[in-house]
Amino acid sequence: HNTTVFQGVAGQSLQVSCPYDSMKHWGRRKAWCRQLGEKGPCQRVVSTHNLWLLSFLRRWNGSTAITDDTLGGTLTITLRNLQPHDAGLYQCQSLHGSEADTLRKVLVEVLADPLDHRDAGDLWFPGESESFEDAHVEHSISRSLLEGEIPFPPTS
């Protein structure tokens, strides 16, 4: 699998999408896992609803949500309030029994928040009548890794 890079800004939400063949993966639950080292296991972060018919419901684990459009064949993962420690290599998986097929390898990169370096006087804060409750703006910039690029930094 090629690795797709998704970039997000620290403190904001990042949306990762993983397309798949909806017929091939019909009836299968999906999962999002984090790769522990280059050759290490992929540690489950969150999986879709236990009832496949309800895969469209967003399922949360901490600040990570997963939802599956089983007809359209798109798995979507949202990382809310992205932090530097969220950077790393992940996988979208399709589950069958105790086995898991990789749908996409994803490298999450966290960019510094440019607002961090501004004076407080330049920042905009919502007024009393304004609410962010439903304003979950999700940003993602994605690209595929070039041949020869290494998703993990070399270990000394």
Epitope: R29, V46, N50, L51, L54, F56, L57, R58, T67, H136
Partner: antibody, heavy 119, light 112 residues
């Protein structure tokens, strides 16, 4: 604290429709799906279905397809259940219940809305 | 649909004594993910239903530890080690392993 506030009791004639509301507060409304459950003397508790408060997508118990319609208004953090062509068999208490996170299904419940159908 | 059967219909218990509620399902509730989606809720008179236990044995926040849930496959039990007056109401089990979700008929706890 988490609260699900449902609309008041209704006494209705057969053949009409009714729309019950459930307003969520004390949490981020779009983070949790909303379930609807019917409680009648004859059938105890029955799951009607669930709606994603984020996308509006729905999943229905086959038994209630054509009878119940679930909708959501994100701007007011309110979920709705509409019941069509009411008969006496629809007389019941209807509850909304919030889907929890991960395997915490239906963690908070509304106080219930009583619907009585009588001519 | 999975049928959930609860026994007894009514349970009369003296304050301070234990109580035991039984719930049986027509199919195994063990999911392919290794979890068993069996839950218990209490409907007190004039109040909203309150979740007590989820995935067989996890206690909801604020639920006293005199409540315990156990079981596997098709047989499940809710136990109260020492019944208190606030425990009266109707106890329901329900399953979330198979579509659609289904509930038991309930067991009414009365205080002797």
């Amino acid at each position: 604290q988490v609260q699900l506030q449902q609309s008041g009791a209704d006494l209705l004639r057969p053949g009409v429709s009714v729309k019950i509301s459930c307003k969520g507060s004390g949490y981020t409304f779009t983070d949790h799906a909303m379930h609807w459950v019917k409680q009648s003397h004859a059938e105890s508790l029955e799951w009607i279905g669930v709606i994603s408060t984020y996308s509006g997508d729905t999943g229905y118990n086959q038994k209630f397809k054509g009878k119940a319609t679930m909708t959501v208004d994100k701007s007011s953090s309110t979920a709705y259940l509409e019941l069509a062509r009411l008969t006496s068999e629809d007389s019941a208490i209807y509850y909304c219940a919030r889907e929890g996170h991960y395997d915490d299904a239906m963690d908070y419940w509304g106080q219930g809305t009583s619907v009585t159908v009588s001519s | 649909d999975v049928v959930m059967t609860q026994t007894p219909l009514t349970l009369s218990v003296t304050i301070g004594q234990p109580a035991s509620f039984s719930c049986k399902s027509s199919q195994s509730l063990l999911d392919s993910d290794g979890k068993t989606y069996l839950n218990w809720l209490l409907r007190r008179p004039g109040q909203s239903p309150k979740r007590l236990i989820y995935v067989v044995s996890k206690l909801d926040s604020g639920v006293p530890d005199r409540f315990t849930g156990s079981g596997s496959g098709t047989d499940f039990t809710l136990k109260i080690s020492r019944v208190e007056a606030e425990d009266l109401g109707v106890y329901y089990c329900w399953q979330g392993t198979h579509f659609p979700y289904t509930f038991g008929g309930g067991t009414k706890l009365e205080i002797k």
